[in-house]
């Protein structure tokens, strides 16, 4: 198992400081850490040195050392804080994509461990995080949403108090995908329709999906009908509706109607027969 020097789990330095991290193993060792500036890497057989003579808040993060040849796959880690009063947050990513049910890590890292007790998470625009969202804060990792739901998809900002002043990170866009994405669910109502010529009629084609990126159309035979689209969001689902309203039906309105909904995954179709009779 590799060993890191300095032999502490956490290291706190000021901006501009010189930082040297050394990893020693039995065989060759490798470093992994946040993508950040100014590091130089020097490897010499079984040891590897990461160093900077100008630490910045962007160097804040966990540096892990592994020994690729180690059958046990052991690793060692050290977390570096570069305590910069002008930069309370170091964002390791601005977009995070997970599948629902997974842990979602919003990687905003505090640059000063003393800030950990005053952190909070908000949705962009100053809105509170949804009440049902279960999350916690880890100084080494950021905010962690325990079991992400599709509904948690949003832009989040991390906040903390520095000397009585609020310090806010830039936004992190969280996208939570369905475990098994599927074509939209559709409904075509009524399932069949018979009208006397001159009567009113309504045919409603609706589709729902967890993702907003889908389309729904209503066709008579092979002809796509130009009908306004109504959109809504309820019970964690996006709903899109095209409703054909006829004040006085005629024989040319009769035929096979198809409701077609599609997204990147596929298409679903429902059909119904509309008959128009003389009397």
């Amino acid at each position: 198992i590799p060993v890191i020097e300095p032999s502490v789990p956490e290291l706190v330095v000021k901006p501009g400081a010189t930082v040297t991290l050394r990893c020693v193993g039995n065989g060759s060792v490798e470093w992994d850490g946040p993508p950040s500036p100014h590091w130089t890497l020097y490897s010499d057989g079984s040891s590897s040195i990461l160093s900077t003579n100008n630490a910045t808040f962007q160097n804040t993060g966990t540096y892990r050392c592994t020994e690729p040849g180690d059958p046990l796959g052991g690793s060692a880690a050290i977390h570096l804080y570069v305590k910069d009063p002008a930069h309370s947050w170091n964002l390791l990513a601005q977009e995070v994509t997970v599948v629902e049910g997974q842990e979602a890590v919003l990687p905003c890292l505090i640059t000063d461990p003393a800030l950990k007790d005053s952190v909070s998470l908000m949705r962009e625009g100053g809105r509170q995080v949804l009440r049902k969202t279960v999350y916690f804060f880890s100084p080494w990792r950021g905010f962690i949403i325990r079991k992400a739901k599709v509904l948690d998809s949003n832009t989040y900002v991390c906040k903390t108090m520095v000397n009585g002043r609020e310090s806010t990170s830039t936004g992190i866009w969280l996208k939570v995908n369905r475990v098994h994405p599927e074509p939209p669910q559709i409904k075509l109502e009524p399932s069949k329709l018979v009208r006397i010529r001159g009567e009113a009629a309504q045919i409603v084609c609706s589709a729902t999906n967890a993702e907003v990126g889908f389309n729904v159309i209503l066709k008579r035979g092979d002809t796509k009908l130009e009908i306004p689209l109504n959109s809504d969001f309820q019970d964690n689902y996006y709903k899109k509706v095209r409703a054909l309203s006829l004040n006085a039906v005629d024989f040319q309105d009769a035929g096979i109607y198809s409701c077609v909904a599609s997204n990147d995954v596929g298409t679903r179709t429902a059909t119904m027969n509309f008959q128009v009779v003389e009397s």
Partner: antibody, heavy 118, light 107 residues
Framework: EVKLEESGGGLVQPGGSMKLSCAAS????????MDWVRQSPEMGLEWVAE??????????FYAESVKGRFTISRDDSKSSVYLQMNSLRPEDTGIYYC?????????WGQGTTLTVSS | DIQMTQSPASLSVSVGETVTITCRAS??????LAWYQQKQGKSPQLLVH???NLADGVPSRFSGSGSGTQYSLKINSLQSEDFGSYYC?????????FGGGTKLEIK
């Protein structure tokens, strides 16, 4: 509030054994690196042993003077760290402190006294 | 093993004075040095980590400096509560050796 409380010290004859315990509270014990440090008028402060967290494979390290005689262990379910001391010598006499390592030895217990004497 | 040599071993000073304690490592410890204060009958307390960073709650009259093998702890305008013993310790690998200590006494 971080609290570390040592117990198990006392008088023991040379060649004897003793087990020290340290009960921790006020922090996530399973994530912590824990050490034992001892102090005597002759040797001053002397680092004895360290056990790291599960994330660091519970790696253990010892001072040369106690290697092969002392064993550090932990029970994360009880938030406790232990020091099993065998083949004790008079020079092992001193106050034994349990400490938590973060950026340094951030927190110390009040200490427990071990006397090795015939 | 890295040896830590601390000086002076003892110091007799008056309240309000400024004192400097030094610590020399037998090899480069890359600023991985901590300073501790210990009052009579009490456990040591962390004062400074990573050579220059004050631990939480430590008054600003304390300051740490140094790099490579040479380090120092400075206490400006000594207060009565500052009297006691001070120790340096390196964190560049194990064993984590301490300096021999400096006893600060009231003149």
């Amino acid at each position: 509030e971080v609290k570390l409380e040592e117990s198990g010290g006392g008088l023991v004859q040379p060649g004897g054994s003793m087990k020290l315990s340290c009960a921790a509270s006020g922090f996530t014990f399973s994530d912590a690196w824990m050490d034992w440090v001892r102090q005597s008028p002759e040797m001053g402060l002397e680092w004895v042993a360290e056990i790291r967290s599960k994330a660091n494979n519970h790696a253990t390290f010892y001072a040369e003077s106690v290697k092969g005689r002392f064993t550090i262990s932990r029970d994360d379910s009880k938030s406790s760290v232990y020091l099993q001391m065998n083949s004790l010598r008079p020079e092992d006499t001193g106050i034994y402190y349990c400490t938590r390592v973060k950026v340094g030895f951030d927190n110390w217990g009040q200490g427990t006294t071990l006397t090795v004497s015939s | 093993d890295i040896q830590m040599t601390q000086s002076p071993a003892s110091l007799s000073v008056s309240v309000g004075e400024t004192v400097t304690i030094t610590c020399r490592a037998s090899e480069n410890i890359y600023s991985n040095l901590a300073w501790y204060q210990q009052k009579q009958g009490k456990s040591p307390q962390l004062l400074v980590h990573a050579a220059t960073n004050l631990a939480d709650g430590v008054p600003s009259r304390f300051s740490g400096s140094g790099s490579g093998t040479q380090y120092s702890l400075k206490i400006n305008s000594l207060q009565s509560e500052d009297f006691g013993s001070y120790y340096c310790q390196h964190f560049w690998g194990t064993p984590r050796t301490f300096g021999g200590g400096t006893k600060l006494e009231i003149k």
